[in-house]
Interface confidence: medium
């Protein structure tokens, strides 16, 4: 070896100065008597050094790098040869920083594996090889006084966490523990912990499970929910607080917390509950009365809410068959009494014989709101409720009896817009207590089976707004009947549209006669249409050659018309426009053309 | 001198209920663990609970979970166990114990006989 | 929860014999086993915890060994006031169950 390098430090701080020195040794035979020494750091020459010989021949060479900013590098003695960069020696040079202090220190109790785990935050980048260590020691009380040491746990190279299996931790006394971070500029100690490993326990949740229902148990009340969770077994021994969240899997509801509840329940019911609505529930326990971290939440359980009975009123109407008055078509709404008024699943119409005790026929049942069914000699009266698997709502009579009341007045209709019809009427005195309106198509479309109906309440309503079923260009019947305490008054009817529709299309014009001066044209009305409201006039248009145009207004009932005034031998444009208070509709244009003064009239 | 003195004991019906009490003294109870044993007639030692120093953990033996609670008062020295429900077979010599930092069963109390017969 | 079985259930020596009792865990339980020795109408008292720790006061002949699921409990010279009951406990988790015991009898 020619050269050898010699450096004040191969470590150092990022940014501090460094000093080298190489030799070269006189017996490098091959060499320049006064050899040139140069410096390479990495791949760059580096000026500045300090070139001497020595009294026993050896040539040195001293150079100081006022600031080390590379975090590695490799610093070269060499000389030239011939044409070429020869190096006598190298080192390598690194740089960084000292550790800074481990924080955020934590650890957590596994059960399962009865180990300690800890984790920590190493701080930034030193930039050189840095080696952590969790330190920890056997203690009484705070930790303050040192007992035994417990064996390091290194953890695995680039990872912040470390595992004290069970041999080595202390579950009936405290421990401290600290991470000691240590590399060749400095060691660094993280703030230490006391803890009694199960003061960090990490529970995990109880597994929630619904109640297997028992025969002589009774069944939950509406609203409510049976359930009951099993503690995890490895922390049974520990005192534990636990609470439940709830939500209704539908809609966006957020979590509502119920709680605190005791680690185990052999029952619980859980209640204030929607009805007939599916719930998720999942429940967590945390160490309690001493601190502790919160379990995961369990894993979901999925129950549904027993249901309540409907809570509904039945607003219901009836109607005979004319040809069979024993037959009647019953019809029925149910009207919310309250917000949550219970899932209907069907209707049942019942009737109860006078003089059999108990004995209630049915009639029918349905999940449709309406029935038809033959009505018994001597039924004047039967009972309509709404079901579910609950119960039932509050059984609704329904009489049938003459219509003895007096009859309403001045009915009458008009659109309001193309969706909506407005049915006004005088009350009639006394005043009924409500309005039956039904509603549907007119002829010839009519249909019993397919009619609306409303139920109005106040007997002093002069109106009603039709919105449900209302289409335009369609001819509606609608049929106002006043109620009374026990019986009702005779129906009244009316027929409007809610919007009509204009001519579809206008008659086709035909010519008749012509002459020089005039010609007669006639045509075949269109028939009139369901939902098209009646033509009011009719205008017949005709051009001639230099586009000038003329016009007659005719009455709705004309048949044909007579041009007069024309040009012999000129050529007309002519056109029929049908309209009615819906709008109007041209015909398609006519184009004929005048006899010559010579010719003779055409009949 | 450590110090452990049970009592509480006696004859009680099956069903019934008793409370033992340990009074302590001779070393600080409040930093260690503590723990009940008993011994049926002409039987093995029987490990029942024991309760951490600050008493947040409390594991019991399933012939006893349930029906027995551990409990502690750092303020008067005194460790107690709770049991309800007593049947034939916890007749025994109950044991009061101090517990070490391993876990061992340091030091113990005389025992105190309780007998559960109709 | 560990289960802990003691050999034998009772043994007959002399005085001056050497005797060995053992007690094998159900699963491994590192070195967190204890001996105690019990005399007719006495509470217990410990004598090695932690495996082969001896406690204060206790005389060098008993000693103990073993970790994991295997351990012994070793008296080497047999003395009058040894005749006793010895049981094993484990306190690696916090259900302590103890063996069954072994009865040393005089032969």
């Known amino acids: 070896e020619c050269g050898h390098i010699s450096v004040s430090a191969p470590i150092v701080h990022l940014g501090d100065p460094i000093t080298a020195s190489c030799i070269i040794k006189q017996n490098c035979s091959h060499l320049d008597p006064e050899p040139q020494i140069l410096w390479r750091l990495g791949a760059e020459l580096q000026p500045g050094g300090r070139q001497q010989r020595l009294s026993d021949g050896t040539q040195e060479s001293i150079i100081t790098l006022p600031h080390l900013n590379h975090t590695q590098a490799f610093l070269s003695c060499c000389l030239n040869w011939g044409n070429s960069l020869q190096i006598l020696d190298q080192v390598e040079l690194r740089a960084g920083y000292p550790p800074a202090i481990p924080h955020n220190l934590s650890c957590l109790m596994n059960l399962t594996t009865s180990s300690l785990i800890c984790q920590w935050e190493p701080g930034p980048e030193t930039h050189l090889p840095t080696s952590f260590t969790l330190k920890s020691f056997k203690s009484r009380g705070n930790c303050q006084t040192q007992g035994d040491s417990i064996l390091d746990c290194v953890p695995k190279d680039g990872q912040s966490h470390c595992c004290i299996p069970r041999k080595h931790l202390l579950l009936y006394q405290n421990m401290g523990i600290w991470v000691q971070a240590e590399n060749a500029l400095g060691t660094s100690m993280s703030p230490q912990l006391c803890l009694d490993p199960m003061d960090v326990v990490k529970l995990e949740p109880p597994m929630l499970r619904t109640m297997d229902p028992s025969p002589e148990a009774a069944p939950p009340q509406a609203g409510c929910l049976q359930l009951c969770w099993e503690p995890w077994q490895p922390g049974l021994h520990i005192n534990q607080k636990c609470e439940l969240r709830h939500k209704p899997q539908r809609g966006e509801a957020s979590w509502a917390l119920v709680g605190p509840l005791p680690l185990e329940a052999l029952q619980y019911e859980l209640c204030g509950l929607l009805p007939a609505t599916a719930y998720t529930l999942q429940i967590r326990c945390i160490r309690w009365p001493l601190p502790g971290h919160w379990s995961d939440w369990s894993p979901s359980l999925e129950l549904r809410t027993t249901e309540r009975a409907p809570t509904v009123r039945l607003d219901t109407w009836w109607r005979q068959r004319q040809l069979d008055p024993r037959t009647v078509q019953l019809f029925w709404k149910p009207v919310p009494l309250e917000e949550d008024s219970g899932r209907i699943q069907g209707y049942v119409v019942s009737w109860r014989p006078s003089g059999q005790a108990g004995a209630i026929l049915p009639l029918c049942n349905t999940t449709e709101l309406s029935c038809t069914f033959h009505l018994p000699s001597e039924a004047q009266e039967v009972a309509l409720v709404a079901y579910n698997s609950a119960g039932t709502s509050r059984p609704t009579p329904v009489v049938f009896s003459e219509s003895r009341g007096p009859a309403l007045t001045r009915l009458h209709a008009m659109a309001r817009d193309p969706h909506s019809l407005w049915v006004g009427w005088e009350p009639p005195n006394p005043w009924p207590q409500g309005y039956v309106i039904e509603w549907g198509l007119g002829p010839p479309s009519a249909s019993n089976s397919n009619k609306t109906w409303r139920m109005e309440q106040n007997g002093r309503a002069t109106g009603f707004l039709l919105k449900e079923n209302i289409r335009p260009f369609q001819l509606y019947e609608i049929i106002v009947t006043p109620l009374y305490q026990d019986t009702m008054g005779p129906s009244q009817h009316v027929y409007a549209y809610s919007q009509e529709m204009a001519p579809s299309h206008a008659p086709e014009l035909h010519l008749k006669h012509i002459g020089k001066t005039w010609a007669q044209l006639e045509w075949v009305p269109e028939p009139p249409e369901l939902g098209k409201s009646p033509l009011t006039h009719y205008t017949i248009f005709w051009t001639n050659a230099q586009n000038q145009s003329f016009s007659a207004i005719l009455n709705a009932s004309s048949r044909g018309f007579v041009l007069h005034g024309l040009e012999p031998a000129s050529l007309y444009h002519i056109h029929l426009m049908a309209a009615s208070q819906a709008g109007a509709t041209n015909s398609t244009v006519l184009t004929l053309m005048t006899l010559t003064p010579e010719g003779s009239e055409l009949h | 001198e450590v110090q452990l003195l049970e009592s509480g004991g006696g004859l009680v019906q099956p069903g019934g209920s008793l409370r033992l009490s340990c009074a302590a003294s001779?070393?600080?109870?409040?930093?260690?663990?503590m723990g009940w044993v008993r011994q049926a007639p002409g039987k093995g030692l029987e490990w029942v609970s024991s309760?951490?120093?600050?008493?947040?953990?409390?594991p019991y033996a399933d012939s006893v979970k349930g029906r027995f609670t551990i409990s502690r008062d750092n303020s008067k020295n005194t460790l107690y166990l709770q049991m309800n429900s007593l049947r034939a077979e916890d007749t025994a010599v109950y044991y009061c114990?101090?517990?070490?930092?391993?876990?061992?069963?340091?030091?113990w109390g005389q025992g105190t006989l309780v007998t559960v017969s109709s | 929860d560990i289960q802990m079985t003691q050999s034998p259930s009772s043994l007959s020596a002399s005085v001056g014999d050497r005797v060995t009792i053992t007690c094998r865990a159900s699963?491994?339980?590192?070195?967190?086993l204890n001996w105690y020795q019990q005399k007719p109408g006495k509470a217990p008292k410990l004598l090695i915890y932690?495996?082969?720790n001896l406690q204060n006061g206790v005389p060098s002949r008993f000693s103990g060994s073993g970790s994991g699921t295997d351990f012994t409990l070793t008296i080497s010279s047999l003395q009058p006031e040894d005749f006793a009951t010895y049981y094993c406990?484990?306190?690696?988790?916090?259900?302590?169950?103890f063996g069954g015991g072994t009865k040393v009898e005089i032969k």
């Open positions: 114990a101090k517990l070490g930092e391993l876990g061992q069963y340091q030091f």
């Open positions: 001779g070393f600080t109870f409040s930093l260690y663990w």
């Open positions: 309760i951490s120093s600050s008493g947040g953990v409390t």
């Open positions: 699963q491994g339980i590192s070195s967190y």
């Open positions: 932690y495996a082969s």
């Open positions: 406990q484990q306190s690696f988790q916090y259900a302590q169950h």
